[in-house]
Every structure is written in C-alpha cells, then in structure tokens.
Amino acid sequence: IPTEIPTSALVKETLALLSTHRTLLIANETLRIPVPVHKNHQLCTEEIFQGIGTLESQTVQGGTVERLFKNLSLIKKYIDGQKKKCGEERRRVNQFLDYLQAFLGVMNTEWIIES
Amino acid sequence: IPTEIPTSALVKETLALLSTHRTLLIANETLRIPVPVHKNHQLCTEEIFQGIGTLESQTVQGGTVERLFKNLSLIKKYIDGQKKKCGEERRRVNQFLDYLQAFLGVMNTEWIIES
C-alpha cells in the first residue's frame, strides 16, 4: 500500500476490512486484550496499538487480513507523526493561550467526562 | 478547591479564569511555549500541561490566578486518571474489536486529518 493514500481513505478502508475479517480475528477465544474503559480514544492510542500488535501476532496471516494490519500500521505511523507535531513549534504565550482555550472548549463540549 | 467539583464544572470555571487573567499571563513577551500545529488536542495533553507548567513558573502568583493553575492541575489529574484507564481492563477480542471499530469511526468522522 503506498503511504500516499490519504489517511481518511485509509481509515475508511480499514473499517471495511475489520468487518470482513471479524470472524477470523475472534477465532482465539482465550486471548485477552486491554480495552479502555472510557471513550476518549485519543488518550489511549498507545494501548490500542499494543492491542493490535497482540492480535496480529495471534492471527493467521495471508490475503487481505495482511492488508488490514498493514493499514493499521500506517494509521499508527500517521498518529505518531501527529504526536511529533505536538511539541515542534515554540510560539508566544498569546498563541498558547488560544490553543489552551480551544482545548478546554473541546473538553467542555465533546469529551466524555465522568465525574 | 475541593476535588469533588465535577470535572465539567471545573473546565467551565477554568475557561472563565483564563479570560480573566489573560493580560497577566501574556506579560512575558520573550517566553515561548510549544503549540501543537494540529487540533487533535487529546494527542497532545502531555505537551499542553508541560506548557502550563512553564507558564506557571513564569507567572506572578496570588489571588485567583492561583486558582486557575490549581484548576489546571486538577484537570491534568483527571486526564492522567483517564490515561490509566486505557489499559486496566483485559477483555475478549470481540470487545477489543468493538472498541477499535469505534476508535476508527471517531477518527473517520471527528479527527482533523490532513493528508
């Protein structure tokens, strides 16, 4: 898969492949994988991809199931790239406060907050 | 501030305090703080709170500006708690796939994806 495929298209294709290979993936009934308790997914990307690694090592490879895991590794690469962009640019306090305000605003309206 | 205050109320109050103390906070014109390039805020919580720490160390404390930084540290505590919950529960592959599907679905519809 060329990494030039837009990430949004990659995510869509991966969702489809996940449905296709569901039966094969759940074949191992004894396998247990950490699953986050909440739905703030972005906080848990490390654990999600560790889980994918565990699943891959337990899944018989071949055909399009390989494509599924290849896609997932490209998505991980994209997320790692985004994480790098968290701290690369040093800006003035003014911009930092605008960003902090946006972050808290998003937290206020979109996060799934359990008290 | 009692930690019993619901996190959602804490976030709202913090947003208000941020507006109130803006002028004081931007007083240091030479200070530079990392600001993420993208808006996938949850991926950048570590950098955001490091930035808050830098800002706090450079800000004259006293009055309600202390309450602002106290609130922000409680929000950090909440997020750290959420991060702990990412890997606590070991579940069957079925549940992990449900979570992965939800994660990719959110990525597909809500993430800010630049190719």
Epitope: R92, Q95, D98 | I112
Partner: antibody, heavy 119, light 107 residues
Framework: QVQLVQSGAEVKKPGASVKVSCKAS????????INWVRQAPGQGLEWIGY????????RYNQKFKGRATLTVDKSTSTAYMELSSLRSEDTAVYYC????????????WGQGTLVTVSS | DIQMTQSPSSLSASVGDRVTITCKAS??????LSWIQQKPGKAPKTLIH???RLIDGVPSRFSGSGSGQDFTLTISSLQPEDFATYYC?????????FGQGTKVEIK
C-alpha cells in the same frame, strides 16, 4: 479542491455596516482558522483578525476591535466579517484566508470582496 | 505591534535576473514569516512559510532565508510571470503584520 468563495462587491454609505461572506469547500470547515485581511486601493495588506470555527473563538487586531465582528455558520461552512460604522477609509478589498495549522501561514485565499464606502 | 520593514519598495529587473527582497522585523519573530505574491487585481498567494519552506507547487526558483529579525526572499532567475508585488508577513504574534510590499517591475 480547497476553495474559499467570497460574496460580491458592496457599496455602502458612511456610518453603515457591511457583512462579507466566505464560503469554504473541499475540506472540513472546523479544522482551520479563518483569517480576514484587507487592502485599501493601491495600499498594502492589513490583518483584521481570525476566527476558530471549531469553538467560535475570535481574536482581533486592536485597530478593528469593536467595529469588526467575525462569525461562522458551521451548517453552511461559511465565515462572515461584519464591519460597522463605516468610513471612507474602509474602502478596500477584503480577503478571507485559511490558516494551515494553528497560527500558521495562510495556505488558501478567497478571491476578495471590494467594499466601497461613499456618500 | 511588530513592524515589518521591506526593502526596496520597488525594483526594475529583466527576465533571467536574480532578485533579492529583504524584510526586517522590529523584534525577534523566530522564523514565523511568510512571503506572499500578489499580481494586479488578483488575490494574494503564499509562496514561502516558516522563513524558508517552499509551499507545494511553488517553483524552486523562489527561496527564503533568515531568522530572528532579518529575512530575505530570492528569485534565482526572474520569469515573466514573476512580475508582481511581494509582501512579507509575520505570524509570530498578534496582530499579524505585513511589510509594505515590494513591486517587481519589468526593466
């Protein structure tokens, strides 16, 4: 492709208000700040302010604070710039421009809207 | 506000010439500077950001350099389509401010 399409030219009387629109297409509207810049005839460029469509937060050049109002309509992916108490020196071409990241460079510009203030 | 001083305000050059435009900020703006091209009656177009990063699709004859307070835009070999006005923009702090422009005319 990514595009910002602005509303047509306007002629206004001094003291009136004008509202210029900027319709975004080809990308997710809430992902990028929209900046507004103006250019008086034969003059340079001047930044008015920006709005973050994600949370409606706007920041203004002090020079325009109180007279300029930046808003967005997320349902139509449209940004608006309203300028009140118009005077002849507000005669200019008004541009919207998309911010590539957070407080980053302007990667896409609208075609501009000429606002003429004349009695 | 940060003042951006561009020089020269205009210049005459021939096709194939190497052209250099400078921009000086009144204070340190790190590398948060972009160069913008504007042709008569047209919308501006950003050529370079972060002082020296060429935007996709912009010809490689354009280059930028500098950091802190002093910045330069260079056109290595002027082409007919390059005759325009060029502006620098600092986006380091609010309000963002532009240089007054440099008009590049045909000699």
């Amino acid at each position: 492709q990514v595009q910002l399409v602005q509303s047509g030219a306007e002629v206004k009387k001094p003291g009136a208000s004008v509202k210029v629109s900027c319709k975004a297409s080809g990308y997710t509207f809430t992902n990028h700040h929209i900046n507004w810049v103006r250019q008086a005839p034969g003059q340079g460029l001047e930044w008015i302010g920006y709005i973050n469509p994600y949370n409606d937060y706007s920041r203004y050049n002090q020079k325009f604070k109180g007279r300029a109002t930046l808003t967005v309509d997320k349902s139509t992916s449209t940004a608006y710039m309203e300028l009140s108490s118009l005077r002849s020196e507000d005669t200019a071409v008004y541009y919207c421009a998309r911010d590539y990241g957070n407080f980053w460079y302007f990667d896409v510009w609208g075609q501009g809207t000429l606002v003429t203030v004349s009695s | 506000d940060i003042q951006m001083t561009q020089s020269p305000s205009s210049l005459s050059a021939s096709v194939g010439d190497r052209v250099t435009i400078t921009c000086k900020a009144s204070q340190d703006i790190n590398s948060y500077l972009s160069w913008i091209q504007q042709k008569p009656g047209k919308a501006p177009k950003t050529l370079i950001h972060r002082a020296d990063r060429l935007i996709d699709g912009v010809p490689s004859r354009f280059s930028g350099s500098g950091s802190g307070q002093d910045f330069t835009l260079t056109i290595s070999s002027l082409q007919p389509e390059d005759f325009a006005t060029y502006y620098c923009l600092q986006y380091d702090d609010f309000p963002y401010t532009f240089g007054q422009g440099t008009k590049v005319e045909i000699k």
